[in-house]
């Protein structure tokens, strides 16, 4: 059913999200996950 397959805010389970990369010290990306899954 829809409720079983979708996250409570309506985003499909397993759909990738793409956070903006974080550069707290200017150079390296310190994002926790590059392309985390939404569960």
């Amino acid at each position: 059913s829809y409720s079983m397959e979708h996250f409570r805010w309506g985003k499909p389970v397993g759909k990738k999200r793409r956070p903006v990369k974080v550069y707290p010290n200017g150079a390296e990306d310190e994002s926790a996950e590059a392309f985390p899954l939404e569960f």
Epitope: V20, K21, D29
Partner: antibody
Framework: QQLEESGGGLVKPGGTLTLTCTAS?????????ICWARQGPGKGLEWIGC???????TYYASWAKGRFTMSRTSSTTVTLQVTSLTAADTATYFC???????WGPGTLVTVSS | DIVMTQTPASVSEPVGGTVTIKCQAS??????LAWYQQKPGQPPKLLIY???KLTSGVSSRFKGGGTGTQFTLTISDLECADAATYYC????????????FGGGTEVVVK
């Protein structure tokens, strides 16, 4: 590492403008997120979108889709083209390296006849 | 679209005081939240990322907290140099327009 915007100025309503974000001290070849935001006079910050300079993938705020186009034009430059300009587009436009303190000083765009 | 609601719009406190700014997301954003300080005529400066991590070189008087939809920025032992406008921003998802700024909070130091 620094960023600097250029290309701002006075534009007539309905016109098109291309802003350039130039990097110094680093290259876009590594695949950084370069993002654009704007700030109207006396107003808050508004996110426009980001470009992944490695893949060339672009991501826009819903309100910016259609009139705004971001491109990587060289290893040190990214452009933002804005079409069908109106007075509501009058703002200081900033480019930034993802989420960081590396922001350009901004370039002022004034849309007026 | 993710909406970031920031309160208050303006706050005034004396030197040495404490200010707390709140930011509420319209949906969960995990800990993908940044806080910026902006002074007139300058670009924003990143203070905090990942909701609570302090950027290198930023005073420990700035403290971020929260997760999910409710976040706070607390500035303690206020100094005159803290007078600025502060913005929260989520960077949760650039695919689905999840990168919006809060409306800003002007901090006046008396």
């Amino acid at each position: 590492q620094q960023l600097e915007e250029s290309g701002g100025g006075l534009v007539k309503p309905g016109g098109t403008l291309t802003l350039t974000c130039t990097a110094s001290g680093f290259s876009f070849s590594s695949g950084y997120d370069i993002c654009w935001a704007r700030q109207g006079p006396g107003k808050g910050l508004e996110w426009i979108g980001c470009i992944d300079t490695g893949s060339g993938n672009t991501y826009y705020a819903s309100w910016a889709k259609g009139r705004f186009t971001m491109s990587r034009t060289s290893s040190t430059t990214v452009t933002l083209q804005v079409t069908s300009l109106t007075a509501a587009d009058t703002a200081t436009y900033f480019c930034a390296k993802g989420i960081s303190s590396i922001w350009g000083p901004g370039t002022l765009v004034t849309v007026s006849s | 679209d993710i909406v970031m609601t920031q309160t208050p719009a303006s706050v005034s406190e004396p030197v040495g005081g404490t200010v707390t700014i709140k930011c509420q997301a319209s949906q969960t954003i995990s800990s993908d939240l940044a806080w910026y300080q902006q002074k007139p005529g300058q670009p924003p400066k990143l203070l905090i990322y990942a909701a609570s991590k302090l950027t290198s070189g930023v005073s420990s008087r700035f403290k971020g907290g929260g997760t999910g939809t409710q976040f706070t920025l607390t500035i303690s032992d206020l100094e005159c140099a803290d007078a600025a406008t502060y913005y929260c921003q989520t960077y949760y998802d650039i695919i689905d327009d999840g990168c919006t700024f809060g409306g800003g909070t002007e901090v006046v130091v008396k």
